[in-house]
């Protein structure tokens, strides 16, 4: 019992429960093919308690094995539209600091209109996870489309 | 030492360990679009450990981030078949109470037979989850193609 | 400050933190239709804290509710190639000990080059896990497509 | 109400080509696969293949290649079989049929049928 | 292609009576959890009428008196009480793959 009320007591990031979901807020200008994040309970249902947004992009904060999430639905799309328009590929990875540069996480549309997917990796603080989004198709908006996001799992 | 044992002597509801794995029971009638879950050891490796079931959808028990996520494979299912008969769509939402009604992930099959998805949501104590299968494809009903499950990530 | 100090001072397999995160190390000869993983550090970012590789497959050490995920991507793929080699089929299941077995998850490829996934299942000590690919086709060995995983999440 | 109203019946020479229409009703037509199903008088019923108006995507029984051609008018709600190279075998009743509510090969709805009779 | 092997191939059953009929696929016919049979009745200078879908569905509109199950490769249609309407021919059908087959029918008549 005094576990419990002690556990409830302690603030939750000295536990390493950092966690974070982002909507997509805007893509970059058309040389630069970042997904530019967003997050905060006034966006919705997306929230950052422990990792920061830095330009859009998510910085850790905390060191450990996170479990990283994506979900990235082409806008107005049929699989007709996504053949046509291949390859459009969607990579996740650290792309700061420079010397940690590195993909996490890659998958390519080809014929479907969403891409969905999920893995397990160290990350430290300080790393700054982009995600690439390569082609000439736009990432849809809608909250229930397109997210991203990343679990502290242990340090 | 005195920690860990305290922590196993401790119901693991009080550490807010809610999970849930569910398994397809069936579709609703015609006009009903919702799928209808079934969980327990009884009917192989699904399991209920804190939100209940009701009337086949999901309810919370606790309030908090939950990692959900979803497979759902159609019955017999070629790409000729998944590409003849678009949209074939799949949405989690919460669907009560109705003051809460929000779609949270949303996929479409286009030239697939499958879509697989997870993401961090907040949920409150009461929110019953519903999966809603738009078209006019079949789910199959088999344990490894179609689960839907929760897990308790932090307050 | 205490409890977090305690906390740290015991070791994480106390705490029943155990993960893993594996890499593609090769494909078995002709009839075996098993995928052969590889982690640790030094290969990479892939790691095994508590379960263990036992011939390329992994084997779990503690008992509990398992987060199960895994990306395969077939190699030099395109839409074309998927649907002209189908089925090509990707399942993980318990391979041993034989009492054990079952299809814990089960995915075709269809049209698409990629397929991940996840879900929540317990395991036991001693439950071997094996990806099996049917098909023609090669998996990637990119570790950024593909990865298989396991997270502790229960008791 | 759903209706499948089919043309009237046929007496062709053998050698000769047929070609039988199903119209449409009570329902949005490029919705619904149509099926066709052969039926040999006093025996049992033999699908040959479908239609689906929407994207004029068709299949057919390994049987019946070359033997049916399945084409549709969206503007009429009318699907259309057209039977080549007509023998005393292809004498029978054939059925246009609609599936159920889902998307699969079980036929709810059917037409009353249009005979077909080959004979010099 | 699947063979549907209908028994008997015709039968008598008295008013009121059960009259059961079976269907033997070649192979399963169960796939995805469902078992892909239906069975309709067929009465002369008729079309064929959907009476059970999935092996047990009973279609919209048919009397429970019309009753369907089985799985893998043996099913039955089961009607009772039989009445007198019942007389005409009934066959199962499989949708598991293409091209879906029929069984060769079972005449029922009403004694």
């Known amino acids: 019992q005094r576990f419990a009320q002690a556990q409830q007591q302690l603030p939750l990031e000295s536990l390493g429960w950092d966690v974070a979901e982002l909507q997509l807020n805007h893509t970059g200008p058309q040389q630069d093919p970042r997904l530019y994040w967003q997050g905060g309970p006034a966006l919705g249902r997306s929230f950052l308690h422990g990792p920061e947004l830095d330009k859009g992009q998510l910085r850790i904060h905390r060191d450990g094995i996170y479990m990283v999430h994506i979900q990235v639905t082409l806008a107005i799309c049929s699989s007709t539209t996504a053949s046509r328009h291949h390859p459009t590929t969607l990579a996740v990875g650290i792309c700061s600091p420079a010397s940690r540069s590195i993909s996490l996480l890659r998958l390519s549309f080809h014929q479907g209109c969403t891409i969905a997917s999920q893995r397990l990796t160290p990350l430290a603080r300080g790393d700054t996870l982009c995600t690439n989004l390569t082609g000439t198709l736009l990432p849809s908006r809608n909250t229930d489309e397109t997210f991203f996001g990343v679990q502290w799992v242990r340090p | 030492q005195r920690f860990a044992q305290a922590q196993q002597q401790l119901p693991l509801e009080s550490l807010g360990w809610d999970v849930a794995e569910l398994q397809l029971n069936h579709t609703g009638p015609q006009q009903d679009p919702r799928l209808y879950w079934q969980g327990g050891p009884a009917l192989g490796r699904s399991f209920l450990h804190g939100p209940e079931l009701d009337k086949g959808q999901l309810r919370i028990h606790r309030d908090g981030i939950y990692m959900v996520h979803i497979q759902v494979t159609l019955a017999i299912c070629s790409s000729t078949t998944a590409s003849r008969h678009h949209p074939t769509t799949l949405a989690v939402g919460i669907c009560s109470p109705a003051s809460r009604s929000i779609s949270l992930l949303r996929l479409s099959f286009h030239q697939g037979c499958t879509i697989a998805s997870q993401r961090l949501t907040p949920l409150a104590r009461g929110d019953t989850l519903c999966t809603n299968l738009t078209g006019t494809l079949l789910p199959s009903r088999n344990t490894d193609e179609t689960f839907f499950g929760v897990q308790w990530v932090r307050p | 400050q205490r409890f977090a100090q305690a906390q740290q001072q015991l070791p994480l397999e106390s705490l029943g933190w155990d993960v893993a995160e594996l890499q593609l190390n090769h494909t078995g000869p002709q009839q075996d239709p098993r995928l052969y993983w590889q982690g640790g550090p030094a290969l990479g970012r892939s790691f095994l804290h508590g379960p263990e590789l036992d011939k390329g497959q992994l084997r779990i050490h503690r008992d509990g509710i398992y987060m199960v995920h895994i990306q395969v991507t077939l190699a030099i793929c395109s839409s074309t190639t998927a649907s002209r080699h189908h089925p090509t089929t990707l399942a993980v299941g318990i391979c041993s000990p034989a009492s054990r077995s079952i299809s814990l998850l089960r995915l075709s490829f269809h049209q698409g080059c990629t397929i991940a996934s996840q879900r929540l299942t317990p395991l036991a000590r001693g439950d071997t896990l094996c990806t099996n690919l049917t098909g023609t086709l090669l998996p990637s060995r990119n570790t950024d497509e593909t990865f298989f995983g396991v997270q502790w999440v229960r008791p | 109400e759903v209706q499948l109203q089919q043309s009237g019946p046929e007496l062709v020479k053998p050698g000769a080509s047929v070609k039988m229409s199903c119209k449409a009703s009570?329902?949005?037509?490029?919705?619904?696969?149509i099926h066709w199903v052969k039926q040999k008088p006093g025996q049992g019923l033999e699908w040959i293949g479908y239609?689906?108006?929407?994207?004029?995507?068709?299949k057919y029984n390994e049987k019946f290649k070359g033997k049916a051609t399945l084409t549709s008018d969206k503007s009429s709600s009318t699907a259309y079989m057209e039977l080549s190279s007509l023998t005393s075998e292809d004498s029978a009743v054939y059925y246009c049929?609609?599936?159920?509510?889902?998307?699969?090969?079980?036929?709810?709805?059917w037409g009353q049928g249009t005979l077909v009779t080959v004979s010099a | 292609d699947i063979v549907l092997t209908q028994s008997p191939a015709s039968l008598a059953v008295s008013l009121g009576q059960r009259a059961t009929i079976s269907c033997r696929a070649s192979?399963?016919?169960?796939?995805?959890?469902?078992?892909?049979i239906h069975w309709y009745q067929q009465k002369p200078r008729q079309a064929p009428k959907l009476l059970i879908y999935?092996?047990?569905n009973l279609e919209s509109g048919v009397p429970a008196r019309f009753s369907g199950s089985g799985s893998g490769t043996d099913f039955t249609l089961n009607i009772h009480p039989v009445e007198e309407e019942d007389a005409a021919t009934y066959y199962c059908?499989?949708?598991?793959?293409?091209?879906?087959?029929f069984g060769g029918g079972t005449k029922l008549e009403i004694k």
């Open positions: 009570g329902y949005t037509f490029t919705d619904y696969v």
């Open positions: 239609l689906h108006p929407y994207n004029d995507d068709t």
């Open positions: 049929a609609r599936r159920g509510y889902y998307d699969y090969a079980w036929f709810a709805d």
């Open positions: 059908q499989h949708s598991r793959e293409l091209p879906p087959t």
């Open positions: 999935l092996a047990s």
């Open positions: 192979k399963s016919v169960s796939a995805s959890g469902y078992t892909w």
